[in-house]
Amino acid sequence: AGVFELQIHSFGPGPGPGAPRSPCSARGPCRLFFRVCLKPGLSEEAAESPCALGAALSARGPVYTEQPEAPAPDLPLPNGLLQVPFRDAWPGTFSLIIETWREELGDQIGGPAWSLLARVTRRRRLAAGGPWARDIQRAGAWELRFSYRARCELPAVGTACTRLCRPRSAPSRCGPGLRPCAPLEDECEAPPVCRAGCSLEHGFCEQPGECRCLEGWTGPLCMVPVSTSSCLGLRGPSSTTTGCLVPGPGPCDGNPCANGGSCSETPGSFECTCPRGFYGLRCEVSGVTCADGPCFNGGLCVGGADPDSAYICHCPPGFQGSNCEKRVDRCSLQPCRNGGLCLDLGHALRCRCRAGFAGPRCEHDLDDCAGRACANGGTCVEGGGAHRCSCALGFGGRNCRERADPCAARPCAHGGRCYAHFSGLVCACAPGYMGARCEFPVHPDGVSALPAAPPGLRPGDPQRYL
């Protein structure tokens, strides 16, 4: 187990004409963030292969607003390292992909917009525990400077973090019921002593006395940069003065491939293998293209309609943004009418309609009373997208199908007794009370303030509720 660490030193317009002034330009304020992806092996990894060794996303950098007429600066970066933990052995050979993303903070519909500014892909050899490796890469018109390293986390040690060791102070036996999960060194050993003079910065060793070189360095002590080895610079049909065989002039002389492309000879010509972000016969055309895999979430990549846009991502429903990186909150557009509930199912929108409405967007107002006769003499009343029945006395429920017990709610006050009647209820009031619900005292405070009882009814008689 261990951690791959990436430190971004700077990101900004590369040298040369035509370099952008800023990632924000007229778009308003923006900020950067980075994504690192690690894939195993040195083979040409397919764009679609996953980041099998791990991936990490940086924090957002400080907000940047372009200052007109000011010189183009290096852009403000997120703080801290990007760390990619790995659980298994460190493979030593890997592909490193670093993406620079722009988050636009202007007034956007649906929140911030993200777009991929640059992507660099490099195949590398790196031993765990070695020093920081520095690199500068171009991606389109941008330049990225960064350092990276892999380090083991104890008790893992070694260039692949596969050996486990026990500190000298640790007990020498496992506890009860435990057994070592991997071969365990009895004690943590000191790193092997490399060949005398082996470069501390560009070399490393796994066995005592050896000197193995990091990418880009050669020689017995790893002190010779690959590009200036003693074999280069000689001319003529061949030369063996330095023990190197050097061919005569060839189509790759002077490296016709721009932007870090590597040249290989073909019969009578040459061929450039371009780094990601460049294409063309001599890798002279810059910019992210469909070959860099810039589209997410099922977007399909086609060429841009004009020379300035190298690609366009055609997004499937539910996604938007220049790289299909933003999920559309399709329900925020309130597609369901008449108070319907919106459900985004991914492949489709569904509206759950309120009673009385129907249709894909709840757009149809149903004739609620049609075919919904109210039983037992009730009458149907429409309103608010729902129907209700005004039931005849003695019936209740949604469709007046339930026989109502008018006495269930104890409607008679002051101890009056309730009697169900064919047309409603009758309250028999306790002595001293009167009214349809026995709600009035006969002599409040000893004074009869009530009107005289209707003819034929005396105070205290049962009264029918009409």
Partner: antibody, heavy 121, light 107 residues
């Protein structure tokens, strides 16, 4: 491993319709576009259209807009293409293919064996 | 529609020869060009994507180059299993189009 299974042959009458199937296995069906390609005997390849299984979205070649209808059944990981109003011009081998899709790669990385459609009375 | 013209129509070679197949586009397709191989009575097989990106499982003797409108598929030391028809395809714009193919046959 990735496989796209297509029936070997279909014999149909002029004026009728036929529904060709393409059953996918060995990968996440809903994450990759499926494309359909026509090849007439001894001739080149013609792109008909694509469908994205998770949403049913399609891209169509205008030439086939009134000829081919693309659908999917995600429950069985099967893509379908219905060809209508068949004529002798529609006699061909029809291939389905998986599009890489990841990263937007619009490239056909796995192909079915093709269904040979013969239109004859 | 973008027209892809492949040449030669037929190429007769002996195993061990190295060959180059050409694909020319009627307008720029940037680097959105791919190569397929189709053997007799089989379905096409992806060889190269985006001009020069190799495909897992495809022998390293196949390579691609070019940009814009002119593209080449190279086969370094042809083997007997390489005989068949080779198609180029563009994904730069709709409709996607294929070349008419180059038939690689035994001399």
């Amino acid at each position: 491993q990735v496989q796209l299974q297509q029936p070997g042959a279909e014999l149909v009458k002029p004026g009728t319709s036929v529904k060709l199937s393409c059953k996918a296995s060995g990968y996440t069906f809903t994450s990759h576009w499926i494309t359909w390609v026509k090849q007439r005997p001894g001739q080149g390849l013609e792109w008909i259209g694509d469908i994205y299984p998770i949403s049913g979205s399609t891209n169509n070649n205008e030439k086939f807009r009134n000829k081919a209808t693309l659908t999917v059944d995600t429950s069985s990981s099967t893509a379908y293409m219905q060809l209508s109003s068949l004529t002798s011009e529609d006699s061909a081998v029809y291939f389905c293919a998986k599009i890489i899709t990841v990263g937007g790669a619009y490239v056909m990385d796995y192909w079915g064996q093709g269904t040979s459609v013969t239109v004859s009375s | 529609d973008i027209v892809l013209t492949q040449s030669p129509v037929t190429l007769s070679v002996t195993p061990g020869d190295s060959v180059s197949l050409s694909c020319r586009a009627s307008q720029s397709v940037r680097n959105n060009l791919h190569w397929y191989q189709q053997k007799s009575h089989e379905s096409p097989r992806l060889l190269i994507k985006y001009v020069s990106q190799s495909i897992s499982g495809i022998p390293s003797r196949f390579s691609g180059s070019g940009s814009g409108t002119d593209f080449t598929l190279s086969i370094n030391s042809v083997e007997t299993e390489d005989f068949g028809v080779y198609f180029c395809q563009q994904s730069n714009s709709w409709p996607l189009t294929f070349g008419a193919g180059t038939k690689l046959e035994l001399k």
